[in-house]
């Protein structure tokens, strides 16, 4: 059975957009005007995982690229990466756990918690032009709140 997906962009709570930084990294920075076209468009797929009224499991692929955000241990630390997959097999309803994020809606803001590493979140730095990363703290210096903008297919 086909997986349900939608196209969207994400901005952090400081309105920084996400753009590619090299082939396997995202960074967050403020964009304006025509530069907004640089921001990555995600194909957000609704996948197997823990689901409730305010929590929906999703996978975040880059639209029309065979790249997905995934969470893995690197040097014993949960780490966010862009992982290349076989486009014949992805997306699928039952993604490997490292690709799954719990999309949590709180006060019209979104958090993306790793299913593989509970209490670790997609995060951005306060500073401009820094990598998007997996952070283990909420409510501190780093930003874990996002807004989503729908993009027509």
């Amino acid at each position: 059975a086909p997986v349900r997906s939608l196209n969207c962009t994400l901005r952090d709570s400081q309105q920084k957009s996400l753009v590619m930084s090299g082939p396997y990294e995202l960074k967050a920075l403020h964009l304006q005007g025509q530069d907004m076209e640089q921001q990555v468009v995600f194909s957000m797929s609704f996948v197997q995982g823990e689901e409730s009224n305010d929590k929906i499991p999703v996978a975040l692929g880059l639209k029309e690229k065979n790249l997905y955000l995934s969470c893995v241990l690197k040097d014993d630390k949960p780490t966010l990466q862009l992982e290349s997959v076989d486009p014949k097999n992805y997306p699928k309803k039952k993604m490997e756990k490292r690709f799954v994020f719990n999309k949590i809606e709180i006060n019209n803001k979104l958090e993306f918690e790793s299913a593989q590493f509970p209490n670790w979140y997609i995060s951005t730095s306060q500073a401009e032009n820094m990598p998007v990363f997996l952070g283990g703290t909420k409510g501190g210096q780093d930003i874990t709140d996002f807004t989503m903008q729908f993009v027509s297919s």
Epitope: A1, E50, E51, K92, K93, K94, K97, R98, Q116
Partner: antibody, heavy 119, light 106 residues
């Protein structure tokens, strides 16, 4: 309370087609996947396949050439057809619901129907 | 298609802790589920998404999943826990069950 009630022929001859139907009572029909699983006597469970309300299916490759799962949303029912049965298809057949709240796994099961294939 | 391997049988004394394992290639990168089946009855989901309990399942049932092994743990095992237990995961978009473990409460 969700209930799955299943029925169908219990005794078949080799080469005949197995047909089972499962009716769903209580809860929404369109928000779930609907599955069939079988269990040969004294053995383990084998997943046969699943369907959603729109009729989109996913089958176990080992049975795919012989299996059809269909849905009748107007009656909240789904059905299993298995063609060209042999003695190896003798099993208890279960229908089940796969729910998003339990991670798309099988949280409600029918009572099971023993299907015996014998000449 | 991957294989999920369970021990055929596990024995435990009442009040003790029973552990049933399920092994499979990179199983920890998938979600694991556990079912209990008593003779003549349909299976019942006891653990979903590695470690979550459906409503109505006692707290003595818990689960974990990492590496190549998922484990169902029953603490303070009771006579009524005697049953067959099946692990389940998915592989290549199909559901796969382990061969089952018969839990005997001595």
């Amino acid at each position: 309370q969700v209930q799955l009630q299943q029925w169908g022929a219990g005794l078949l001859k080799p080469s005949e087609t197995l047909s089972l139907t499962c009716a769903v009572y209580g809860g929404s029909f369109s928000d779930y996947y609907w599955s069939w699983i079988r269990q040969p006597p004294g053995k383990g469970l084998e997943w046969i396949g699943e369907i959603d309300h729109s009729g989109s299916t996913n089958y176990n490759p080992s049975l795919k050439s012989r299996v059809t799962i269909s849905v009748d949303t107007s009656r909240n029912q789904f059905s299993l057809s298995l063609s060209s049965v042999t003695a190896a298809d003798t099993a208890v057949y279960y229908c089940a619901r796969a729910s998003p709240s339990s991670g798309w796994t099988l949280d409600y099961w029918g009572q099971g129907t023993l299907v015996t294939v014998s000449s | 298609q991957s294989v999920l391997t369970q021990p055929p049988s596990v024995s435990v004394s009442p009040g003790q802790t029973a552990s049933i394992t399920c092994s499979g290639d990179k199983l920890g990168d998938k979600f694991a589920f556990w079912y209990q089946q008593k003779p003549g009855q349909s299976p019942v989901l006891v653990i979903y998404l590695d470690n979550k309990r459906p409503s109505g399942i006692p707290e003595r049932f818990s689960g974990s999943n990492s590496g190549n092994t998922a484990t169902l743990t029953i603490s303070g095992t009771q006579a009524l826990d005697e049953a067959d237990y099946y692990c389940q995961a998915w592989d290549s978009n199909i559901e796969v069950f382990g061969g089952g473990t018969k839990l005997t409460v001595l």
